[in-house]
């Protein structure tokens, strides 16, 4: 399945929107820095079947969407930027779902990769727990925003590798 050209444009737009969501200087939040243990190994170039990669990418985007679609995020971040961010994430999810639907006869897709999916979910659970412990402070959101930018970039790299394999 070919992810449309608009998919990579959407990725770039999502990253720009995340960058624009910055409200305070990261330097004022150095004491709040935290290692969320991004599951890098799930995004490294191991011998992923395409359906596995799509499933992991979908999970990454859905969990990002969940994280930014709570009332706490609406209170802390610019709502106009959030709404635009949602549009990009939803488009990404639709593209990936479309892809899985096309792949489905060939590869037994969504259920085979539970460990990879769980690793992504646990990563987001750590982020949510951190935000809760920090009482959703502006510095906590800044740390999380920067973290999601980093992880989003890594997932974009996986998508690029997928495309180059086609």
């Amino acid at each position: 399945c070919d992810l449309p050209q608009t998919h990579s444009l959407g990725n770039r737009r999502a990253l720009i929107l995340l960058a624009q969501m910055r409200r305070i200087s990261p330097f004022s939040c150095l004491k709040d820095r935290h290692d969320f243990e991004f599951p890098q190994e799930e995004f490294d170039d191991k011998q992923f079947q395409k359906a596995q990669a799509i499933s992991v990418l979908h999970e990454m985007i859905q969990q990002t969407f969940n994280l930014f679609s709570t009332k706490d995020s609406s209170a802390a971040l610019d709502e106009t930027l959030l709404d635009e961010f949602y549009i990009e994430l939803d488009q990404q999810l639709n593209d990936l779902e479309s892809c899985v639907m096309q792949e489905v006869g060939v590869i037994e897709s969504p259920l085979m990769y539970e460990d990879s999916i769980l690793a992504v979910r646990k990563y987001f659970q750590r982020i949510t727990l951190y935000l809760t412990e920090k009482k959703y402070s502006s510095c906590a959101w800044e740390v999380v925003r920067a973290e999601i930018m980093r992880s989003f970039s890594l997932s974009i790299n996986l998508q690029k590798r997928l495309k180059s394999k086609e």
Epitope: E59, F68, D90
Partner: antibody, heavy 126, light 110 residues
């Protein structure tokens, strides 16, 4: 766990419109779709449409296009179903339903209905 | 558009017996997007099996799902009194998202 609470029973005249609401509480995300499913007396289940509350994006079943409008508020998370030009055969229990964020993977979670409202009876009668 | 046909319409059985319910699709459906629900009189449907064969939380292991392509089954190994109900299969297709239900199979006490 998600709880879905629907508005009360309604009696409507043919040709009029009805609006049913569904308030979600618990572990809710506006990033997951809320669907409307109806069930006529003694009949099976029929999917009507869904909304993604975060965006207001809707998808409607072919049978209802032109008569159905689904809307949502993000806070408190509430979905609304409006059905116009009511006919006698629209007499049914109307359920709102949503997927589960716990099902692995998420790509599977949105393909099903894990949580259901208690149902709202709409009677079309002259 | 996919049509799901369930058979039989009604199944009359005694507690302790096994039941096999069929759901046939008019075109291929990935088993991952095939779901089963149980509905008792006066109640909302309840998620039973998803992904073709995964049991939802709290569903006893006497319920199992199987099949692929166009033919799917829900099996209840030993019917308990609380199992008597109407069972629906449901499929999902995208894009755009479309959810389709079968017409239901009623499992009643003989």
């Amino acid at each position: 766990e998600v709880q879905l609470l629907e508005s009360g029973a309604e009696v409507k005249r043919p040709g009029s419109s009805v609006r049913v609401s569904c308030r979600a509480s618990g572990d809710t995300f506006s990033s997951y779709p809320i669907s409307w499913v109806r069930q006529a007396p003694g009949q099976g289940l029929e999917w009507m449409g869904r909304i993604l509350p975060a965006l207001g994006v809707t998808n409607y079943a072919q049978n209802f296009r032109g008569r159905i409008t689904i809307t949502a508020d993000k806070s408190p998370l509430t979905a609304y179903l409006e059905l116009s030009s009511l006919r006698f055969e629209d007499t049914a229990v109307y359920y709102c339903a949503s997927p589960s964020a716990d099902i692995i993977p998420s790509i599977l979670g949105t393909t099903l209905f894990a949580f259901w409202g208690q149902g709202s009876l709409v009677t079309v009668s002259s | 558009e996919i049509v799901l046909t369930q058979s039989p319409g009604t199944l009359s059985l005694s507690p302790g017996e096994g039941a096999t319910l069929s759901c046939r699709a008019s075109q291929n459906v990935s088993r991952h997007y095939l779901t089963w629900y149980q509905q008792k009189p006066g109640q909302s449907p309840r998620l039973l099996i998803y992904g073709g064969s995964s049991r939802a939380t709290g569903v006893p292991d006497r319920f199992s799902g199987g099949g692929s392509g166009t033919d799917f089954t829900l099996t209840i190994s030993r019917l308990e009194p609380e199992d008597f109900a109407v069972f629906y299969c449901q499929s999902y297709h995208s894009p755009p998202p479309v959810y389709t239900f079968g017409q239901g199979t009623k499992v009643e006490i003989k």
